[in-house]
């Protein structure tokens, strides 16, 4: 009886099992009982990354500099191009189809995790004892100045946005 299922790396067509084309090659013609599957290598800037019966190769992804993208890894006949973002930007999606500028942490917030090409800046509110008085994509929350270690006293309490103000101790008469 004609086969109803085929082995791995084969496909069923016209009651016959034909070899799939290897990664990096596309299907030109199905096998017959007299000749094997005819495959051709993908062209420049094309790829196929699986054993396949595709009649067209996929185009490599274009890393559009106008969208803030650059090539992280050049594509081959078997792999797609991998894009990443230019310095100071990160991808807007898993597929990195566009980039946006890294977020800055507002005053009162510090950087918990610095942004990468694929993830945005993670900010955290400055806890008691810490402050940030700038909008920054790099600055962490800084600890308030310790007046005591300078033999000074707190003249103005710190906030999450301002440091304490130290001053001399009142002298006892």
């Amino acid at each position: 009886e004609p086969p109803t299922a085929c082995r791995e790396k084969q496909y069923l067509i016209n009651s016959q099992c034909c070899s799939l084309c290897q990664p990096g090659q596309k299907l030109v013609s199905d096998c017959t009982e007299f000749t094997e599957t005819e495959c051709l290598p993908c062209g420049e800037s094309e790829f196929l990354d699986t054993w396949n019966r595709e009649t067209h190769c996929h185009q490599h992804k274009y890393c559009d500099p106008n969208l803030g993208l650059r090539v992280q890894q050049k594509g081959t006949s078997e792999t797609d191009t991998i894009c990443t973002c230019k310095e100071g930007q990160h991808c807007t999606s898993k597929d990195c189809e566009a980039c946006v500028l890294h977020r800055s942490c507002s005053p009162g917030f510090g950087v918990k995790q610095i942004a990468t090409g694929v993830s945005d800046t993670i900010c955290e509110p400055c806890p008691v004892g810490f402050f940030s008085n700038v909008s920054s994509a790099f600055e962490k929350c800084h600890p308030w100045t310790s007046c005591e270690t300078k033999d000074l006293v707190v003249q103005q309490a710190g906030t999450n946005k301002t440091d304490v103000v130290c001053g001399p101790q009142d002298r006892l008469r």
Partner: antibody
Framework: EVQLLESGGGLVQPGGSLRLSCAAS????????MSWVRQAPGKGLEWVSG????????YYADSVKGRFTISRDNSKNTLYLQMNSLRAEDTAVYYC??????????WGQGTLVTVSS | DIQMTQSPSSLSASVGDRVTITCRAS??????LNWYQQKPGKAPKLLIY???SLQSGVPSRFSGSGSGTDFTLTISSLQPEDFATYYC?????????FGQGTKLEIK
């Protein structure tokens, strides 16, 4: 024992017709692709035509396309080659062969076709 | 059609010799190549399929290798019954095509 026996060869004039037969025995004929291969006197082998198993597709060399027709009768375990518009360059020994995994593992003894006026 | 070119066209050798016949395809055919032996007045006989697999019943002194466009048939130690004509045949593209043959003669 697998056996393939060709018949139907002979002398024919240019433009004439001939029908070759290949009687198969010793195997399940319908399960195998079959082909015709020819060999001109003192020359090499030339694949002429093939027919798939289970009534599969038919395939031809460019040199015979439109003139030769391959067919099979699974109930009679017989392969045929209808040859029309014969030319002098079709003169050859014609072999039928059984196909398995893209190779011809059993061949007949051949039948001679001579096209001459 | 794919052209298959064998070399040499003829070859003289002695019993016990190691003999190599080459076959070149006009374009890549992966490992989709068979080798046949034909003796005068007889039908061809399949020796090697898929470039390097020995057909059942064929002596192990016969071996095949190669892929892409260049293939070889090797007989490790010639026996008297090996003097014949050898053909390569591709099945990577329709239609299947044969090489022109290599005639192996006794020296």
């Amino acid at each position: 024992e697998v056996q393939l026996l060709e018949s139907g060869g002979g002398l024919v004039q240019p433009g004439g017709s001939l029908r070759l037969s290949c009687a198969a025995s010793g195997f399940t004929f319908s399960s195998y692709a079959m082909s015709w291969v020819r060999q001109a006197p003192g020359k090499g082998l030339e694949w002429v035509s093939g027919i798939g198993s289970y009534g599969g597709g038919t395939y031809y060399a460019d040199s015979v396309k439109g003139r030769f027709t391959i067919s099979r009768d699974n109930s009679k375990n017989t392969l045929y080659l209808q040859m029309n518009s014969l030319r002098a360059e079709d003169t050859a020994v014609y072999y039928c062969a059984r196909y398995v995994n893209f190779g011809m593992d059993y061949w007949g003894q051949g039948t001679l076709v001579t096209v001459s006026s | 059609d794919i052209q298959m070119t064998q070399s040499p066209s003829s070859l003289s050798a002695s019993v016990g010799d190691r003999v190599t016949i080459t076959c070149r395809a006009s374009q890549s055919i992966s490992s989709y190549l068979n080798w046949y032996q034909q003796k005068p007045g007889k039908a061809p006989k399949l020796l090697i399929y898929a470039a390097s697999s020995l057909q059942s019943g064929v002596p192990s002194r016969f071996s095949g290798s190669g892929s892409g466009t260049d293939f070889t048939l090797t007989i490790s130690s010639l026996q008297p019954e090996d003097f014949a004509t050898y053909y390569c045949q591709q099945y990577g593209r329709n239609p299947p095509t044969f090489g022109q043959g290599t005639k192996l003669e006794i020296k």
